[in-house]
């Protein structure tokens, strides 16, 4: 799903207040709900009728440093017999997410939000167009 | 997929530098790759064999203010005949994501990262255990 543009309001102070100095804001240390965890079933990526693999990208100047991307294994979907059914489509499910980019020059460290497109998994769908061969 | 705990390194300055004052950091205004967009197939939530609905939660003190959650419509999956097959499972695909929480007292505005669990869509899986009914 899409993250809307920031516009010019969310990160600004109210109009009656002095502007933010130097184009930066105060980011408090610590993460709210840091211990919240995904509780998905085991191995759904291989048990799915639209199975997928995971690739991990690593960047020490990004939080989280590890971003996991899914890739659908098949064009079609896997049927009850374990065979690929090409009358159906394996389709990626994508999500826009925020990460934090760390920028440092010597002892001057600042952070910036970055939007990242993550493929979270795949789902099996009916094709829209059944065209004449 | 899981966001690891922040620990005490990512948001800290190097040890040789003076510590961050008041437990806060500098967050630069603007978002890198802000114009990046999801390009998913049309209506996959209703075309999927594990279809889902969307619910929007809204919070003006969160960025993004709108967070969309998916809920699987079925317990089982939809077969080629459009009937539900309860020998299969519709399973949510979840993703941990970051949002920014705005906190203000008068003209003093600060921000904090918050971890949110988002259900992005659903996929159809084979149960591991086929138990006697």
């Amino acid at each position: 799903r899409k993250i809307p543009k920031v516009g010019h309001t969310f990160f600004q102070k109210p109009e009656s207040c002095p502007p933010v100095p130097g184009g930066s804001m105060k980011l408090d240390i610590g993460i709210i709900n840091e211990n919240q965890r995904v509780s998905m079933s085991r191995n759904i990526e291989s048990r799915s009728t639209s199975p997928w693999n995971y690739t991990v990208t690593w960047d020490p100047n990004r939080y989280p440093s590890e971003v996991v991307q899914a890739q659908c294994r098949n064009l079609g979907c896997i049927n009850a017999q374990g065979k690929e059914d090409i009358s159906m489509n394996s389709v990626p499910i994508q999500q826009e997410t925020l990460v934090v980019r760390r920028k440092h020059q010597g002892c001057s460290v600042s952070f910036q939000l970055e939007k990242v497109l993550v493929t979270v998994g795949c789902t099996c769908v009916t094709p829209v167009i059944h065209h004449v061969q | 997929r899981k966001i690891p705990k922040v620990g005490h390194t990512f948001f800290q300055k190097p040890e040789s530098c003076p510590p961050v004052p008041g437990g806060s950091m500098k967050l630069d205004i603007g978002i890198i790759n802000e114009n990046q967009r999801v390009s998913m197939s049309r209506n996959i939530e209703s075309r999927s064999t594990s279809p889902w609905n969307y619910t929007v939660t809204w919070d003006p003190n969160r960025y993004p203010s709108e967070v969309v959650q998916a809920q699987c419509r079925n317990l089982g999956c939809i077969n080629a005949q459009g009937k539900e097959d309860i020998s299969m499972n519709s399973v949510p695909i979840q993703q941990e994501t970051l949002v920014v929480r705005r906190k203000h007292q008068g003209c003093s505005v600060s921000f904090q990262l918050e971890k949110v669990l988002v259900t992005v869509g659903c996929t159809c899986v084979t149960p591991v255990i086929h138990h006697v009914q």
Epitope: S41 | Q69, Q71, N74, L75, E84, N89, P92, L117, T119
Partner: nanobody, 125 residues
């Protein structure tokens, strides 16, 4: 973590009706399919009914189908079990549960991680 609290159980005459409620607090209620299970004295806990995350789909065990109805109200973070035409063999402690895993089909008890403390339903003849 999700906390579940059942209510609505009581003594009722055979043929009567009851509505059990299960109030959820904690993590997002809509993230979970929900189920009702029951346990009669000296018997194992057994599946009664389940409802999907969206509330669009329900499933029942054979011995309650047509008599019991499961529903959910996401605005109130509550799941209900409406029980009609009650029989003495429906006497049990009824438990509400949230499904967090998908290793079995919807009636597989081990897939339900969060449980309430139960509410007693007694049907007298």
């Amino acid at each position: 973590e999700v906390q579940l609290v059942e209510s609505g159980g009581r003594l009722v005459q055979a043929g009567g009706s009851l509505r059990l409620s299960c109030a959820a607090s904690g993590r997002t209620f809509t993230s979970y399919p929900m189920g009702w299970f029951r346990q009669a004295p000296g018997k194992e806990r057994e599946f009664v009914a389940a409802i999907s995350m969206s509330g669009d789909d329900t499933a029942y065990t054979d011995f309650v189908r047509g008599r019991f109805t499961i529903s959910r109200d996401d605005a109130r973070n509550t799941v209900y079990l409406h029980m009609t035409s009650l029989k003495p063999e429906d006497t049990a402690v009824y438990y509400c549960a949230a499904r967090t895993s998908y290793d079995g089909t919807y009636d597989y008890i081990d897939d339900y991680s969060y449980w309430g403390q139960g509410t007693q339903v007694t049907v007298s003849s």
